[in-house]
């Protein structure tokens, strides 16, 4: 499709033509103040230097002002998430100004050309903000730029170019190609606003990473490790194999960042929490469910600005759809002994019973091999609020059913033909809730019977000695 003004150079050429031959200049970046929740409403187009539309459309100088910045597009038309985000912002912040930054003419290009256009779009936003700052009562501190994909880097440029410091930039899965590893002035970075929070939902360490992998904000949140999002697998999005393509999976995972942000706006009573961790594997092991020293935070709109944090990587698990919130638990299981285990890797399953609800049977993901005579840490999460935990049912199986494991099991059996039965000895389970930060210890129901064979179950109840309960220092976020 045609580029009316393309990168900065072309725009400059166009503007410096002699008046006589200057073509009609249509702005390639438009600012639409969404004055109504009604999608049919045309809104108000703001124009640099023209104060009348601000007055006519009731621009509130003292209120929060959101600028929503879309990304690269393969269609010349807004994508559906935009309506959801605008609507959610209007619902949550009734007096706020919600401005859609429409740069479709410059975004509906080859990706490389759209990337080259991000700077000029960022500059346009900065100029608009500089002009607004000349008005009485308008404060840059009340400005929140929300950029999706390529739009996140546009927001970065805007924050970099503006006179002063923007209050907040939220990067929703900032684009990866041509930005990964780039200099801080050529991508979104913590210097671009007073607070920069980022959601990463489509990062890949192999193949093309649509979203940027590196941390680029004050806090960088990686839901589900920042890669495979629940509900976005091929089976989930295709409905039936006759319909859809891999493109739908990409869209689902990349766009998930937007929906997580929308969720944080509309489901205020169901906030999702993320936990600081050095990497995804450690988080999967359940090591990082601490709220001490600002190590946890709400995600999305409710995220709290953390002082002195830069590039702080945070992780959480989510549901497949709204509300995305799950309840995280760290489980520490001390395996006292193996009996006749050979080379078999156990796979644990737990069912949690609470005052509000009971969980489904949950597998404990093994990130590293189970250690004997050692405490093994796992992460489990439930979609429902179980309330206070009352008891835990534990079972285990010999191996996950891969050909390699089946071969190991067969080899183990052949080496011990008189295998008298494999057993594990587990006496207690220590549990910590990520959301409440409460710690509990669960003891085997029958202290004399703590051995468990594959397929059998072992029950654990809260230990009698004051439940061995501890509370960590109060988290800095408002936990429910």
């Amino acid at each position: 499709s045609p580029t009316p003004f393309g990168p900065e150079g072309q725009l400059a050429d166009e503007l410096h033509k002699p008046k006589a031959i200057q073509t009609e200049v249509k702005p390639s970046v438009r600012f639409n103040l969404r004055t109504s929740k009604d999608p049919e409403h045309e809104g108000c187009y703001l124009s640099l230097g023209h104060s009348q539309p601000l007055e006519d459309c009731g621009f509130n100088m003292t209120a929060k002002t959101f600028f929503i910045i879309h990304g690269w597009t393969m269609s010349g038309i807004f994508e559906n998430w935009l309506h959801k985000l605008v609507s959610a912002l209007h619902t949550r912040e009734k007096d706020a100004n919600v401005v859609v930054v429409d740069w479709l003419p410059l975004a509906h290009q080859l990706y490389t050309d759209a990337v080259n256009n991000t700077r000029v779009v960022g500059h346009s936003i900065a100029r608009m903000l500089d002009w607004l700052q000349e008005k009485d009562d308008f404060s840059l501190g009340n400005v929140h730029l929300i950029g999706y994909s390529l739009g996140a880097h546009v927001a970065g440029y805007a924050g970099n170019f503006v006179k002063g410091t923007v209050g907040r930039i939220t990067g929703l899965d900032p684009a990866g190609p041509m930005f990964e590893g780039a200099d801080i002035h050529k991508r979104l970075s913590p210097d671009d606003a007073d607070f920069v929070d980022v959601l990463h939902t489509y990062t890949r360490s192999f193949g093309l990473s649509i979203g940027i992998q590196m941390p680029v904000g004050h806090i960088d949140i990686y839901p589900n490790g920042g890669d495979f999002q629940p509900g976005c697998g091929l089976n989930d999005v295709l409905g039936s194999m006759a319909y859809g393509t891999i493109t739908e999976v990409v869209k689902c995972e990349h766009e998930r960042a937007v929906h997580l942000f929308v969720d944080s706006l509309v489901n205020q009573d169901k906030p999702s929490f993320a936990f600081q961790c050095t990497d995804s594997n450690r988080f999967k092991k359940g090591i990082c469910l601490s709220c001490r020293k600002n190590r946890c935070n709400s995600i999305g709109y409710n995220a709290k600005k953390m002082r002195n944090k830069r590039n702080s990587k945070m992780y959480l698990k989510t549901r497949a759809g709204m509300p995305f919130r799950v309840y995280h638990y760290q489980m520490k299981i001390h395996v006292f002994s193996y009996k006749n285990m050979g080379e078999i890797e156990p796979t644990f399953y737990v069912t949690l019973y609470g005052t509000n609800a009971d969980s489904q049977t949950l597998p404990l993901e093994i990130v590293e091999r189970i250690e004997q005579n050692a405490t093994n840490t796992f992460l489990v999460y439930t979609e429902e609020d179980l309330g206070d935990l009352l008891k835990i049912q534990l079972t285990w199986e010999g191996a996950s059913q891969s050909w390699y494991n089946l071969w190991k099991e067969l080899r183990s059996y052949l080496s011990q033909p008189h295998n008298p039965g494999r057993e594990l000895n587990i006496r207690r389970i220590r549990v910590k809730s990520g959301e409440t930060q409460r710690k509990l210890t669960f003891c085997a129901e029958d202290p004399e019977n703590t051995s468990i064979s594959p397929g059998r179950e072992l029950w654990f109840r809260k230990c009698r000695d004051g439940w061995r309960m501890k509370n960590e220092t109060s988290p800095t976020v408002e936990l429910p």
């Epitope: 499709s1 045609p2 009316p4 438009r30 999608p39 049919e40 269609s75 559906n80 929906h259």
Partner: antibody, heavy 119, light 107 residues
Framework: QVQLVQSGAEVKKPGASVKVSCKAS????????MHWVRQAPGQRLEWMGG????????TYNEKFKDRVTITRDTSASTAYMELSSLRSEDTAVYYC????????????WGQGTTVTVSS | EIVMTQSLATLSVSPGERATLSCRAS??????LHWYQQKPGQAPRLLIK???QSISGIPARFSGSGSGTEFTLTISSLQSEDFAVYYC?????????FGQGTKLEIK
Amino acid sequence: QVQLVQSGAEVKKPGASVKVSCKASGYTFTDYTMHWVRQAPGQRLEWMGGINPYYGGTTYNEKFKDRVTITRDTSASTAYMELSSLRSEDTAVYYCAKGDYYGGSYNYWGQGTTVTVSS
Amino acid sequence: EIVMTQSLATLSVSPGERATLSCRASQDISNSLHWYQQKPGQAPRLLIKYASQSISGIPARFSGSGSGTEFTLTISSLQSEDFAVYYCQQSNSWPYTFGQGTKLEIK
């Protein structure tokens, strides 16, 4: 009030092309997307594609991508849909429809243009 | 593409009664669902947008509900002019798709 007025009925031979026009009035033409939807006799409605009249950006249904071209003339506030390599199964009523700001729902429709493809 | 299914091809209801029409999406479309009414020889008419938002000029007896994959159009008290074909349409992702329609006929 918003009005979309389409060109008249067409009879075409297989392999030919047809170009249907849709003149908009009662609103700012460049502020809203324009979409084309067709309906074969007794069939469901089928979205063919849309255009952003502000700068001419288009998106098409893959099913028609190689055969359909949507254009606009902003000075005349008119959108066009051209369908080439016509076959008998393209016999249908073709509608233009004005999208909302986000292009999702269609509150205003043209009266429809009947295109008959017959040898 | 997202497949929209209107399970009832025809629904027979008496005037004055309530009519409930359903529409199912093959995957989650949140609230990006719109309902149209079409009478013979006429263009479709938008009744409900974004699952539940009413349209200016459309009688209050028309209401919509649902989210995700299951949606419902309810006509609280059928009038003679309501007997027509009703289509649902999703705008969650390209290509936009319509259901096959439900014909509402007089019982």
